[in-house]
């Protein structure tokens, strides 16, 4: 009788282990599905917003000519701002002309008023030269007004209608830029 009870107990334990394994597999499968779902949704969102609507810019981005701009709603240091833009398939704003600068400052006035926004401009520590993130030099009229006396790395930001410089480790809003999608119609 005791042997019978012990055999049943072992069988039950074995069953329990199998059920736990199945539950673990199911949880893992569910997690995997959720992850796949997340990517599918992101992919669908991107596809729908760009292809279906033939919209040149994603939702919440502003268009001007061939560019789309995203004005952040969070603060971050310059390097984190750069990474946040990369996550969206964009780079920190690179201002090519006075016309673009005027558009940006005009848009900022409408959206948020007079705050600081990181752009993709930084000063080389050795040469002191200002360079955009792709390595190109800013046009003479688009050099930051000397304002930062920082011993640390210095980066460029936009405030009101000026381009200024500050320690890259300070917290500011930021602006991302990507190319607008051409309509295939």
């Amino acid at each position: 009788k005791l042997l019978q009870v012990s055999t049943i107990a072992m069988q039950q334990q074995e069953k329990l282990i199998q059920q736990e394994r199945a539950l673990l597999n199911f949880t893992e499968w569910k997690r995997s599905c959720a992850l796949q779902m997340k990517y599918c949704q992101a992919f669908m969102q991107n596809s729908l917003s760009s292809a279906h609507n033939s919209s040149p810019c994603p939702n919440n981005w502003i268009q001007n000519r061939e560019s789309c701009y995203y004005v952040s709603e969070i603060w971050s240091i310059w390097h984190t701002s750069q990474e946040n833009c990369l996550k969206e398939g964009s780079t920190l704003l690179q201002i090519e002309s006075k016309e673009e600068m005027d558009f940006i400052t005009g848009s900022l006035r409408k959206i948020k008023g007079s705050y600081d926004y990181w752009v993709g401009l930084s000063q080389d520590g050795h040469s002191g030269r200002w360079l955009w993130q792709d390595g190109s030099s800013p046009s003479p009229g688009l050099l930051p007004a000397e304002r930062s006396q920082s011993a640390n790395q210095v980066c460029g930001y936009v405030k009101s209608n000026s381009l200024l410089s500050s320690n890259c480790s300070t917290w500011k809003y930021f602006i991302c830029e990507k190319y607008a999608l051409r309509s295939s119609v």
């Epitope: 990517y39 992101a42 996550k87």
Partner: nanobody
Framework: QVQLQESGGGLVQPGGSLRLSCAAS????????MGWYRQAPGKQRELVAA?????????ADSVKGRFTISRDDAKNKNTVYLQMNSLKAEDTAVYAC?????????WGQGTQVTVSS
């Protein structure tokens, strides 16, 4: 999930060149940008260069004019290269590839680059 496979690291003399490559596989539709980071012993990890799915590039100040990041369009934009010229001793580090997604980021194992005579 996204898997990243780096190659091309090694030992090179100062002034020499190396070309690193990073091949992505898996759920690559979720990737918006790819980049290279480096970390030297006792130093913070830094972003060296990155490229977006549209081909926009960004570089660290210390490598501008010497390093070039590019993408292999023939391979569905899932292979990224870092051409490193005029290498200096201070470029010695472990170089790791990173894939940027809106929701998640993925890292490669890293490859050692040593610049020494």
């Amino acid at each position: 999930q996204v898997q990243l496979q780096e190659s091309g690291g090694g030992l090179v003399q100062p002034g020499g060149s190396l070309r690193l490559s990073c091949a992505a596989s898996g759920s690559i539709v979720s990737i918006n940008s790819m980049g290279w980071y480096r970390q030297a012993p006792g130093k913070q990890r830094e972003l060296v260069a990155a490229i977006t799915d549209q081909g926009r590039t960004t570089y660290a100040d210390s490598v501008k004019g010497r390093f070039t990041i590019s993408r292999d369009d023939a391979k569905n934009k899932n292979t990224v290269y870092l051409q490193m010229n005029s290498l200096k001793a201070e470029d010695t580090a472990v170089y790791a590839c990173k894939a940027f997604g809106r929701f998640d980021d993925y890292w490669g194992q890293g490859t050692q680059v040593t610049v020494s005579s």
